[in-house]
């Protein structure tokens, strides 16, 4: 097992709201769970963006996933991710 | 009202194990992560490790990681801090805490295990 | 991992004073970072999150501030009720870490 890497970034989306992108890379194996959680709870489905998950040429994998927050918000924002029974939380770098 | 209702003090002899047990109510147990906290006597706090109740994951602090094993029970939403080997420094106040985003909010009472032969 | 450095380690102080506490990080935690309330024999209470926000049912008297690496804690008049162990916790990192602790007592 080779867990991931996992980098947070924001970007100016339109006005007020930022989009923010959990990115994790370079795991194996590629069954991964990665999500955006608001005050602690998951956000619905419908709310996220996932990319698929891809091989990144070295025998491991990569994802993300991305979401839409009003900014000032930033701070109730953490990615979460799970792999091979360990998960870890990344919050949003201001 | 959210509660983190914790089992009571034990007493330990060098090399056993201990589990103490945290029990939550006032909210849905799954939705949030549960972490642990120890604090020796007259010292700071000290980080443990984390559970996702809802599917098991856990995240282990390195210095503890060969010595410790959390679980949760999500049928009475009770979540378990196991430690082996104990050894005197282990003596301490140990809290569960809920995870609220980006900090703790709600704390157990903590409970006291003493090691010693 | 991420040291937690809080000064002072103790204080006297009266009723009515001006108290404050500060947290170094040794690296920057881009302000995720809590202050908590803690009794003897009691856990301990969360007075503010995110370096600022003051949680639920805190008295306005309780401020926090700052950014980067650099962090304070400030009661703008202490009352009787505040004598006591004041932590803070970074949360930008696991292992989450914690200053020593702020002993606060009465002159």
């Known amino acids: 097992t080779v867990p991931p890497m996992v980098n947070v970034t924001r970007s100016e989306a339109s006005e007020g709201n930022i989009t923010v992108t959990c990115r994790a890379s370079g795991f194996y194996p590629w069954n991964i769970t990665l999500s955006w959680r608001q005050d602690g709870v998951s956000l619905s489905h419908d709310t996220q963006q996932w990319g698929d998950v891809l091989p990144d040429g070295n025998g491991t994998y990569q994802t993300w996933v991305a979401t839409r927050i009003c900014q000032g918000e930033e701070q109730r924002f953490t990615c979460y991710m799970e792999h091979s029974g360990n998960h870890s939380t990344h919050p949003v770098p201001s | 009202e959210v509660q983190l209702v914790q089992s009571g003090a034990e007493v330990k002899k060098p090399g056993a194990s201990v589990k103490v047990s945290c029990k939550a109510s006032?909210?849905?147990?799954?939705?949030?992560?549960i972490e642990w906290v120890r604090q020796a006597p007259g010292q700071g706090l000290e980080w443990i490790g984390a559970?996702?109740?809802?599917?098991?994951?856990?995240n282990y602090n390195e210095k503890f990681k060969d010595r410790v094993t959390i679980t949760a029970d999500t049928s009475t939403s009770t979540a378990y801090l196991e430690l082996s080997s104990l050894r005197s420094e282990d003596t301490a106040v140990y809290y569960c805490?809920?995870?609220?985003?980006?900090?703790?909010?709600?704390w157990g009472q903590g409970t006291l295990v003493t090691v010693s032969s | 991992d991420i040291q937690m450095t809080q000064s002072p380690s103790s204080l006297s102080a009266s009723v009515g004073d001006r108290v404050t506490i500060t947290c170094r990080a040794s690296?920057?935690?881009?302000?995720?970072l809590a202050w908590y309330q803690q009794k003897p024999g009691k856990s301990p209470k969360l007075l503010v999150y995110?370096?600022?926000t003051l949680a639920d049912g805190v008295p306005s008297r309780f401020s926090g501030s700052g950014s980067g690496t650099d962090y304070t804690l400030t009661i703008s008049s202490l009352q009787p009720e505040d004598f006591a162990t004041y932590f803070c916790?970074?949360?930008?990192?696991?292992?989450?870490?914690f200053g020593q602790g702020t002993k606060v007592e009465i002159k």
């Open positions: 916790q970074q949360f930008w990192t696991t292992p989450y870490t």
């Open positions: 805490a809920r995870f609220l985003g980006n900090y703790f909010d709600n």
């Open positions: 559970i996702n109740p809802g599917s098991g994951a856990t």
């Open positions: 995110y370096a600022e």
């Open positions: 690296g920057n935690i881009h302000s995720y």
């Open positions: 006032g909210y849905a147990f799954t939705n949030y992560l």
